[in-house]
Amino acid sequence: MAVTACQGLGFVVSLIGIAGIIAATCMDQWSTQDLYNNPVTAVFNYQGLWRSCVRESSGFTECRGYFTLLGLPAMLQAVRALMIVGIVLGAIGLLVSIFALKCIRIGSMEDSAKANMTLTSGIMFIVSGLCAIAGVSVFANMLVTNFWMSTANMYTGMGGMVQTVQTRYTFGAALFVGWVAGGLTLIGGVMMCIACRGLAPEETNYKAVSYHASGHSVAYKPGGFKASTGFGSNTKNKKIYDGGARTEDEVQSYPSKHDYV
């Protein structure tokens, strides 16, 4: 029960985290104009990974996309890549983890397969979370570096904008969303990995019980294959312990054939 809860919670936490990573990636407020030096500005600038925006005195916000790919700074491209990789890995992880959930039965999927899938999704969530945290941190570092640059027409490296001294940019809401979301995805991934460890031993126990039961139920009678009651009872055992190591179970039930030798 605890394993199912851990797995379910890990899935939900990761789901929230990935939704947050997607939200952060799409948000325009990765960097916002620092109002410390100019608190009376009627024109408020903020920038995202895909476009830069200006909120004017009328309350109207105008956004312009970065319609160049080669003209953008390598750091911005790297952040974009990290966030996209994080989203893709997270999405695949979610897909895998849905099938791995213990509370969801899909055909005759064995617990060992579910354990492997849980571990796979957990690792994917961990990597996804790390990608998001790395992406946001790289961008934050870029902001901190640019904040202290005081060259009159410095190239800020955010959307290829030329920035004059008076406009400095500080951390936007998207950075905090990204950090939190990355952290949640990471935590969710760790929970999935923990749940996997809980799933694996249960399977081993089942196999052990299965072997034990098989051993006791086989009746070694010289009456040949038909006379063997053990084969029939072992079939029942296999239905009860739908556990995975079938070949071994079958090997256990066949010694009666050797009576012919």
Partner: antibody, heavy 115, light 113 residues
Framework: EIQVQQSGPELMKPGASVKISCRSS????????IHWVKQSRGKSLEWIGY????????RYNQKFEGKATLTVDKSSTTAYMHLSSLTSEDSAVYYC????????WGQGTLVTVSA | DIVMTQSPSSLTVTAGEKVTMTCKSS????????????LTWYQQKPGQPPELLIS???TRQSGVPDRFTGSGSGTDFTLTISSVQTEDLAVYYC?????????FGAGTKLELK
């Protein structure tokens, strides 16, 4: 069609207060701030402040802080400006303006303060 | 506060003449975020509210005749009327749309000779 309609002229006694209305239609009312501008006879324009109809947030020109109070009623898409403790200096035409770069202005409300 | 200085205060012209009026701001109106100058020009005829002519220093408002041209950057701006018509007789105001409080120039009055 975008329209910005202001209330009629007001003749007030010194020390009294007045509330001017500005009704907007034909556009998304909560998407643009409503700005208020004062124009004394034969003089230039003075920005009083704005109100954000979406949040109700306001910003005032320091010169008009305490004199003007801006409010909004989203349901009737109407902005209001309340002028208190009127003096002869407050006699002027008051305009409300909205949309990008003050593209639309009300016709103006003449406030006359006289004993 | 940003001070807007307009010159001349009045202009006497004849129809068809080219007219240039200037507006100087005490601080730069250039926004580095989008490289736009937040200066607006309005035309006000007697008994009427101001009417938007040009935004962001050079963007003509739709419906405004192309004889009106705005130019300039930073602190120095110009409004040019290539061929004055009688309906252009009005007061022209420039406005700082970059910093609070938003401020207007004293205006340039265009009169007929």
């Amino acid at each position: 069609e975008i329209q910005v309609q202001q209330s009629g002229p007001e003749l007030m006694k010194p020390g009294a207060s007045v509330k001017i209305s500005c009704r907007s239609s034909g556009y998304s009312f909560t998407s643009y701030y409503i700005h208020w501008v004062k124009q004394s006879r034969g003089k230039s324009l003075e920005w009083i402040g704005y109100i954000d109809p979406f949040s109700g947030g306001t910003r005032y020109n320091q010169k008009f802080e305490g004199k003007a109070t801006l409010t909004v009623d989203k349901s009737s898409t109407t902005a209001y400006m309340h002028l208190s403790s009127l003096t002869s200096e407050d006699s002027a035409v008051y305009y409300c303006a909205s949309l990008r770069f003050f593209a639309y202005w009300g016709q103006g409300t003449l406030v006359t303060v006289s004993a | 506060d940003i001070v807007m200085t307009q010159s001349p205060s009045s202009l006497t012209v004849t129809a068809g003449e080219k007219v240039t009026m200037t507006c100087k701001s005490s601080q730069s109106l250039l926004n580095s975020g989008n490289q736009e100058n937040y200066l607006t020009w309005y035309q006000q005829k007697p008994g009427q509210p101001p009417e938007l002519l040009i935004s962001r220093a050079s963007t003509r408002q739709s419906g405004v005749p192309d004889r009106f041209t705005g130019s300039g950057s930073g602190t120095d701006f110009t409004l040019t009327i290539s061929s004055v018509q009688t309906e252009d007789l009005a007061v022209y105001y420039c406005q700082n749309d970059y910093s609070y409080p938003l401020t207007f120039g004293a205006g340039t009055k265009l009169e007929l000779k």
